[in-house]
């Protein structure tokens, strides 16, 4: 069944900047991806990029650069300047609506203690919900 | 509010087709996807397809593949599957539903039209 | 396909009794969705994502389950609770329907 996995980095030359890797395993193909931190979309989160594959993507502060990486996996640098930057412990989901079967949604966050430019290998997330 | 109207009943000879409409009303049309279920006398529900109307993409249950083909005109916000080759066993009513919404959260298939009833016989 | 097998097919409960309805997946869905019909009307979201309750739901409907095994309960069933109730999977294509269970009132 389908998975969404979620891998968040900080970078080494810029202690406050993150990247955010997000994937999806499935066979449906993905209509849209939505990126947001603070916690799901919809449900408290706030929207940092949204990935169309015909329509483009759009960015809000603090996100910096969004770009499909593969076909069913996209990344997104956060600027780390500015009140709005984030924070070790931030959580951050990513929900790829995939055709036919719906939304699947997944979020992680910092590794704890995790060296600046480390970070573990991206596993499957905790699926939050799939409409 | 969201209204789901589907057409009406339809009686037709074995081997004819049949297109139904679904027409779409108090939503954006392009926004939700739409899910067709059969549902014959007194059984239940069957998955035949989903269309995304934003982009036309179709999704098939296998088993109605060649059966049943769906299709949208964006510009009346209206949904339609034909049925071709009909028997007896395509005797059922034919629901429309709201499918996904891509942008947010929300519940599958919260909306669905009245049904079409398609009798087939001679 | 993933067969979805639903128990009991019909039964019957007194008001006030409580009520639940099982849904047993011939292979593991991530969640399972459910639906109220009754007769002459068209099938209704009743709960998504396994225990989210659908808009103006009675509080007295509650899901749960996971993996293989799912299931609707009613803590007090009351004369409009009397409907077939379907489960229903999309973690896998095609998305599948229980056969039904058809819940009357005594």
């Known amino acids: 069944t389908p998975e969404v996995w979620v891998q968040v980095r900080m970078e080494a030359t810029e202690l406050s900047s993150f990247t955010i890797r997000c994937g999806f395993l499935g066979s449906g193909s993905i209509s849209l991806v939505t990126v947001s931190w603070g916690g799901p979309n919809g449900a408290g989160g706030t929207t940092l990029a949204v990935l169309h594959p015909e329509r483009g993507i759009r960015q809000w502060a603090p996100a910096r650069q969004a770009r499909w990486e593969t076909q069913s996996s996209i990344s997104l640098i956060l600027e780390g300047s500015g009140a709005s930057s984030p924070c070790a412990n931030t959580t951050f989901c990513c929900k790829f609506a995939s055709f036919p079967e719906g939304s699947w949604e997944a979020c992680g966050s910092l590794p704890p203690s995790s060296d600046p430019g480390l970070s573990a290998p991206p596993t499957p997330a905790p699926i939050l919900r799939a409409d | 509010e969201v209204q789901l109207q589907e057409s009406g009943a339809e009686h037709v000879m074995p081997g004819a087709s049949v297109k139904m409409s679904c027409k779409a009303a108090?939503?954006?049309?392009?926004?939700?996807?739409m899910y067709w279920v059969k549902q014959r006398p007194g059984q239940g529900l069957e998955w035949i397809g989903t269309?995304?109307?934003?982009?036309?993409?179709?999704s098939y249950n296998q088993k109605f593949r060649g059966k049943a083909t769906l299709t949208v005109d964006e510009s009346s916000s209206t949904a339609y599957m034909q049925l071709s080759s009909l028997t007896s066993e395509d005797s059922a009513v034919y629901y429309c539903?709201?499918?996904?919404?891509?942008?947010?959260?929300?519940?599958?298939?919260?909306?669905w039209g009245q049904g079409t009833s398609v009798t087939v016989s001679s | 396909q993933n067969v979805l097998t639903q128990s009991p097919a019909i039964m019957s409960a007194s008001p006030g009794e409580k009520v639940t309805i099982t849904c047993s997946a011939g292979?593991?869905?991530?969640?399972m969705h459910w639906f109220q019909q009754k007769p002459g009307t068209s099938p209704k979201l009743w709960i998504y994502?396994?225990?989210n309750l659908a808009s103006g739901v009675p509080a007295r409907f509650s899901g749960s389950g996971s993996g293989t095994s799912y299931s609707l309960t009613i803590s007090r069933m009351e004369a409009e609770d009397a409907a077939t109730y379907y489960c229903?999977?999309?973690?896998?294509?095609?998305?599948?329907f229980g056969s039904g269970t058809k819940l009357e009132i005594k």
């Open positions: 539903a709201r499918d996904f919404i891509i942008t947010v959260n929300y519940p599958v298939v919260d909306y």
């Open positions: 108090g939503y954006t049309f392009t926004d939700y996807w």
């Open positions: 269309i995304d109307t934003s982009d036309h993409k179709t």
């Open positions: 292979s593991s869905v991530n969640y």
């Open positions: 994502s396994t225990s």
């Open positions: 229903q999977q999309r973690s896998s294509l095609p998305f599948t």
